[in-house]
Every structure is written in structure tokens, then in C-alpha cells.
Amino acid sequence: ECGHISVSAPIVHLGDPITASCIIKQNCSHLDPEPQILWRLGAELQPGGRQQRLSDGTQESIITLPHLNHTQAFLSCALNWGNSLQILDQVELRAGYPPAIPHNLSCLMNLTTSSLICQWEPGPETHLPTSFTLKSFKSRGNCQTQGDSILDCVPKDGQSHCSIPRKHLLLYQNMGIWVQAENALGTSMSPQLCLDPMDVVKLEPPMLRTMDPSPEAAPPQAGCLQLSWEPWQPGLHINQKCELRHKPQRGEASWALVGPLPLEALQYELCGLLPATAYTLQIRCIRWPLPGHWSDWSPSLELRTTERAPTHHHHHHHH
């Protein structure tokens, strides 16, 4: 090849200057002995190249682009060859930003998949290939002293979450967890979380059911609903509190919240509702009094209150 471009840096901060040099070898005899080297960024010709003949007979042109405002562009050096431009060499230039500090790192422990799932916000677009790595270590104390490192968790391209499998977790023991972001312009690290996976446990919600009417039980009062729930069995050994929400199916009413309810109540009579009205109900639970995450809301249960207008309004528990 007759020409070769070298650049001060192929990847720079967006808006920064970049300097490039194009050298044409002397043995390219088919060329004009004093060729004029031209520069092109993308499709645009770039003025300002300074050209000189070096002592070994090669020609060199140096150009400084004062601000690289393209996130990606090809810089080429060329010669006029007849009526056309003959490209001698080209390089890809990239411009962008170093990664911002990943923020809002949070994790939850899924006891069904046996994994700790952590997610974060990556920050503004860098315009450059940027890798994220979830890093962690085991710690006997409050993460001031680092124990065994845990294998890095690398998310799939474009994802801002990663799952640490059970074999790398120790329950009831703290872990230090942080996200490292890296690209050609730098590295940044999120603030470190220190957590016991069990303290971020997210349980499955109970399933709401209609209470089977029994011969000896009194029918629900007017404006009342009788319901029961079946807890998620694997989570039953975890102390929890739950809350119920309900709203009329028709109209624009917002959800009304009832709770806290002990998971073990298993049955509930909800009163003070509109008579002869269809309601949508959902339940969710959280590990308590120890720390945890609220479960998702359960699938909806739809029930209808009895016809007659209620005589009094109250909430009443059945244990």
C-alpha cells in the first residue's frame, strides 16, 4: 500500500481535537513526484493539512481536526488521480464519553430461581462500546474486610441487570456488591452495596380464593366479602406481613389498602363495602419484621358483595 495513516488517538472525548498523519512512501513511482495529499472526514474534504517531504523521500501530511463532533467517522487521506480521488488509507475515529458512575444499584433474592438479581441504571449514553460487570465478594462483617471474591457477573449486551447463582451466594452472610463500567476512555464504579441476600428476599404472593361456604358459618353481612388465601408454601417458614387492596370493578375508584394482615390469618372478612357491587382484590406480602422486598401483587380475585345495604362498617379478622 502506498499510504498509511496514524492518529494521535483513535478514540477521543466528543469535541476534543485529533491529529493525524498520512505518509506516502517514495517507491510509489506511479505517483506524481510532488503529490498533494488531501484529507476527508466522512464525505467532507478537510482543509488545513500541512505537507512536507521527509529526508527519506516520503511525503507526509499532518492535519489537526480541532473538534471531533462525530461519534463515529472515517478519516481518509487521498490523492487526486485523474478526475477521481484515490484513497490511500483510512482509519475509523470514535468519539464519546467515559462511563458515568452506574447508579441506583439494587438487588433482590429470588428463592425459586435461587439467584440474587441485581439491576442498575447505566447513566447517559457514552457513544462507545461500554462493558458493565457486576462484581462482588463475601464478607464476614460489614463489608469493610473482603473475603472470597465471587465470579464476575457479566450481563448480556444492552442489559442492566445480572443474576448471581446460588453456588456463589452465602445466605445470612454479607456480600459487597458493585457495578464497574468500562470503555476506551475510562472506568467508573458504583457505590458498593453491603447486603445479606436474605434481607432482599422477594417472596411469591399468596393466591386469593373465595371462602367455601360452610353450613355452620354465617353468610357474609351486607357490604362484606369473605375471602381466604393460600400462601406460597416454600415461603411459609418466613415471618411475613401482608396487605390487601380492593376496588370496585366499575368506575374510576382508586385502590383501597387494608393491612397489615398476618400471612397466617388465611381467612378474612372485609366489610364496609358498597352493597351489590363487584370488587377486584389482590394481596401481597413482605418478610417482616426482618428486611425484605414486597412480593408482586397476586392475581386478581373478583367477588361481589351481597345485595342489602350494610348496617355498619368495620374490618374484622378471623383467626
Epitope: 428463592l111 435461587s114 436474605m198 416454600p234 417458614h237 397466617e264
Partner: antibody, heavy 118, light 107 residues
Framework: EVQLLESGGGLVQPGGSLRLSCAAS????????MGWVRQAPGKGLEWVSS????????PYADSVKGRFTISRDNSKNTLYLQMNSLRAEDTAVYYC???????????WGQGTLVTVSS | DIQMTQSPSSLSASVGDRVTITCRAS??????LNWYQQKPGKAPKLLIY???NLQNGVPSRFSGSGSGTDFTLTISSLQPEDFATYYC?????????FGGGTKVEIK
């Protein structure tokens, strides 16, 4: 010291009744599920029953359902197993156990022997 | 109800041997599998909970693995005090079934 101490075992005739107790100390009893596990002579472990921290959930093994009743008194830090209509096959060492959040039996008592024989 | 099947029911091994005991659940139990050690005349002792978590104070030569229906307890280098009977137990359902046990004897 964290410990569980069973009592109430002994010799009883078939059809008879017995009440086992398990006194807990060294931990907040009211926060934990508790359970009973038995072991017949020369045999393996058999889960009998468990009880939730407040006493509202009480699953039983099919082999004892309707005959045994598990209960607890959180004010006394004590777990009970009322055993009625006892049979020869109920002869075993009965262990009281403290359960963890993942259903594991974290702590065991020393066991009390129940012998059902005429 | 979930049934737990342990194998082998007994094995003979020497001090220093690597020993593997398996436990199979009749249906998927995620990681809700616990392992216990019991010596003659003594109460059982929890070794491993949630399939692979070592209980405090248990030597690191004990390890657990597996998920779903198939689980393994491994003793990397058998010590004289490890000759005992080992039980698995599921805690996915609140009816906490045990496996039949594996007796580890001196060869």
C-alpha cells in the same frame, strides 16, 4: 445458651395418650416455626408436625393426622405435642426442632423416648 | 406429597476418601433441600441448608450441590468423626419429608 429440652416421654398402652413438652431457651421463641421429628428404633427420621410462629398453621404427617395435636405457648417458650390413640408404631424417640426460614431444622433437642406397648 | 429417595442406603469408605451421597425428589423443589448428620444415640445435626449453604461451624469438607430434583452431598476427605448416617430433607412443601438415610461405615 441456645437449647431445646424435651420431656413427657414414657411407657403408654395402645390407645392411650401422652403429652410431650419442649422448653426453649436462648432465642426469641415467638419468631420461629417449631417442629417434632421422630425416629423409631433402628429406623430413619420421620417428620411428624410443625407449627408456625403464632400457631396459626399446623401441618401434620398423614400417619398422625387426627390423632396428634401440635401447639405452642409463646409466653412460656414451650412447644407441645398432644398424642392420642397411640399405636405400637408410634414408638420412637421424639425430637423437638427449631426451624429456620428455609425450613431447615437448625437446632434439635436431645429427644424423649415414647414407648407404646401393652 | 413429595417423596425423597436417598442412595446408596449404606456405603463403606476409608479415612481420606471422597464420598458422594445423592438425594432425589419426586418433583422439583428448587433449592429447598437440607442435609443432616446423625451419630448413634445422638440428635441429628444440620450440615447444609438450601442445597449448598454450609451451616455455621460445619467443616468446609462438606458441600452440597444440585437443584430441582437431584442433589448431592459431598465429603471431600472423609475424617474419622464423619462415620455416621446422613439424611436429606425437602422444605419446598411444609410437610417436611426426609430421605431414608445413608449410613457411612468404615471399610
Amino acid at each position: 445458651e441456645v437449647q431445646l429440652l424435651e420431656s413427657g416421654g414414657g411407657l403408654v398402652q395402645p390407645g392411650g395418650s401422652l403429652r410431650l413438652s419442649c422448653a426453649a431457651s436462648g432465642f426469641t421463641f415467638s419468631l420461629y416455626w417449631m417442629g417434632w421429628v421422630r425416629q423409631a428404633p433402628g429406623k430413619g427420621l420421620e417428620w411428624v408436625s410443625s407449627i408456625s410462629s403464632s400457631g396459626g398453621v399446623t401441618p401434620y404427617a398423614d400417619s398422625v393426622k387426627g390423632r396428634f395435636t401440635i401447639s405452642r405457648d409463646n409466653s412460656k417458650n414451650t412447644l407441645y405435642l398432644q398424642m392420642n390413640s397411640l399405636r405400637a408404631e408410634d414408638t420412637a424417640v421424639y425430637y423437638c426442632a427449631k426451624l429456620g426460614e428455609l425450613g431447615q431444622s437448625m437446632l434439635w433437642g436431645q429427644g424423649t423416648l415414647v414407648t407404646v406397648s401393652s | 406429597d413429595i417423596q425423597m429417595t436417598q442412595s446408596p442406603s449404606s456405603l463403606s469408605a476409608s479415612v481420606g476418601d471422597r464420598v458422594t451421597i445423592t438425594c432425589r425428589a419426586s418433583q422439583g423443589i428448587s433449592s429447598y433441600l437440607n442435609w443432616y448428620q446423625q451419630k448413634p444415640g445422638k440428635a441429628p445435626k444440620l450440615l447444609i441448608y438450601y442445597a449448598s449453604n454450609l451451616q455455621n461451624g460445619v467443616p468446609s469438607r462438606f458441600s452440597g450441590s444440585g437443584s430441582g430434583t437431584d442433589f448431592t452431598l459431598t465429603i471431600s476427605s472423609l475424617q474419622p468423626e464423619d462415620f455416621a448416617t446422613y439424611y436429606c430433607q425437602q422444605s419446598w412443601q411444609i410437610k417436611l419429608k426426609f430421605g431414608g438415610g445413608t449410613k457411612v461405615e468404615i471399610k
